[in-house]
């Protein structure tokens, strides 16, 4: 969490941002809030990015003002116009690119004063893994697949019964480049699994951590997966 204060002749206002991560090819949110103003026409929001010649986005007098917007962001940005009056300056970024990563500044002017805060935005690819029993294999085998990751993650297997066991000798992980030549499909196979046990396939890079669990018993198979973004901190 980053909290910024304005420094000018006018009073300063508090602006708060939260570091976040964007999934390549999907839409992302750059979070920013500020002390609200009673008049929408008095609020100016400017989003800037380190290394970018133009503005990422500008909102003033109740509408988008894009004459100074950088070409790299043209047609890809929007604020939540109906929420500006309550102090939400968050930016929606469409079709997140790997190169959108970096330091952004949320700069606010209201009738109360000015303020700004920086935000670190990471980009990559992350997806939920799915673990299945591989019935084609000669021995009891589990197959963990996740369609899109970048940068290349690590994959670790764990088991509820054999806690702390190292499965690297009985697993094999491969990474296959997807058609857009950036993200990769992750496939990990675990051999010699036993029934009545819960196995976890954990995939992690510096942006996200995802886990796929599978419980195999004689009568049923239960699956569960979850994904967590790393390093989301407010400023």
């Amino acid at each position: 969490l980053i909290i910024g204060f304005g420094i000018s002749g006018r009073h300063s206002i508090t602006v708060t941002t939260v570091a976040s991560a964007g999934n390549i090819g999907e839409d992302g949110i750059l979070s920013c809030t500020f002390e609200p103003d009673i008049k929408l026409s008095d609020i100016v929001i400017q989003w800037l990015k380190e290394g970018v010649l133009g503005l990422v986005h500008e909102f003033k007098e109740g509408k988008d003002e894009l004459s100074e917007q950088d070409e790299m962001f043209r047609g890809r940005t929007a604020v939540f116009a109906d929420q500006v009056i309550v102090g939400n300056a968050s930016l929606r970024l469409k079709n997140v690119q790997l190169t959108d990563a970096g330091t952004y500044k949320c700069y606010i002017i209201t009738s109360k004063g000015k303020g700004n805060a920086n935000l670190e935005y990471k980009t990559g690819a992350f997806s939920m893994p799915e673990v299945n029993v591989d019935y084609n294999a000669s021995s009891e085998t589990l197959r963990c697949e996740a369609p899109r990751w970048f940068p290349q993650p690590t994959v670790v297997w764990a088991s509820q019964v054999d806690q702390g066991a190292n499965f690297s000798e009985v697993s094999n992980t491969s990474f296959e480049l997807n058609s857009e030549n950036v993200t990769m499909k992750v496939v990990s196979v675990l051999y010699n699994v036993t029934i009545n046990n819960t196995y976890s396939c954990m995939i992690e890079n510096d942006i996200a951590k995802a886990t796929g669990d599978i419980k195999v018993t004689e009568s049923e198979i239960k699956r569960r997966s979850h994904l967590q973004l790393l390093n989301s901190k407010a400023s």
């Epitope: 380190e50 290394g51 010649l53 133009g54 100074e68 917007q69 070409e71 790299m72 790997l98 970096g102």
Partner: antibody
Framework: EVQLVESGGGLVKPGGSLKLSCAAS????????MSWVRQTPEKRLEWVAG????????YYLDTVKGRFTISRDNSRNTLYLQMSSLRSEDTAMYYC???????????WGQGTTLTVSS | DIRMTQSPSSMSVSLGDTVSITCHAS??????IGWLQQKPGKSFKALIY???NLEDGVPSRFSGSGSGADYSLTISSLESEDFADYYC?????????FGGGTKLEIK
């Protein structure tokens, strides 16, 4: 076809001033960021200054800050670099560079030579 | 400032060879890197942007790869017109900075 044509280079004494121009054609000039990049006699490349499409935001290399001013006239499709307090280390070929739809170094002019010498 | 360390500074190669030029940034630049070509006595031509994307009209024998702080330009099956100087440039942060260049010469 995108064309960038630089002019205004020449021989200047240390401490002198000079203004470079870059005439642009073949694209919607006001939409794109522009930069000046120089190549020293040793062939080293240095980004000197940049300006956004609308002309309100400018950025400079620290060693030229306060001495050089980048500006643009979107009605004339022209980019400028006003240089003052020139030093011998400013001697270089100066290139006008345009952002395209892809990134900041898409299109390059042919360059204009600045020599600072007494 | 981000320092771009480019290597090698020069290389002698033969027609038909495959060559790789690398650039290491002093910090991560999230693929905000381009590759440029300069032929003797001429200006610059953009080859690659955003680390891996080929500019329009650039032959497919040119390719870019890398992530984080390490990037490379690969030219496969070199042709006579490819003998030139090559530079990387980062645009993740001001000031934009360039690698020192690689001179590709015919062996």
């Amino acid at each position: 076809e995108v064309q960038l044509v630089e002019s205004g280079g020449g021989l200047v004494k240390p401490g002198g001033s000079l203004k470079l121009s870059c005439a642009a054609s073949g694209f919607t000039f006001s939409r794109y960021g522009m930069s000046w990049v120089r190549q020293t006699p040793e062939k080293r490349l240095e980004w000197v200054a940049g300006i956004n499409g609308g002309g309100s935001y400018t950025y400079y290399l620290d060693t030229v800050k306060g001495r050089f001013t980048i500006s643009r006239d979107n009605s004339r499709n022209t980019l400028y670099l006003q240089m003052s307090s020139l030093r011998s280390e400013d001697t270089a070929m100066y290139y006008c560079v345009s952002q395209g739809s892809n990134y900041y170094f898409d299109y390059w002019g042919q360059g204009t030579t600045l020599t600072v010498s007494s | 400032d981000i320092r771009m360390t480019q290597s090698p500074s020069s290389m002698s190669v033969s027609l038909g060879d495959t060559v790789s030029i690398t650039c290491h940034a002093s910090q991560g630049i999230s693929s905000n890197i381009g590759w440029l070509q300069q032929k003797p006595g001429k200006s610059f031509k953009a080859l690659i942007y955003h680390g891996t994307n080929l500019e329009d009209g650039v032959p497919s024998r040119f390719s870019g790869s890398g992530s984080g702080a390490d990037y490379s330009l690969t030219i496969s099956s070199l042709e006579s017109e490819d003998f030139a100087d090559y530079y990387c440039v980062q645009y993740a942060q001001f000031p934009y900075t360039f690698g020192g260049g690689t001179k590709l010469e015919i062996k």
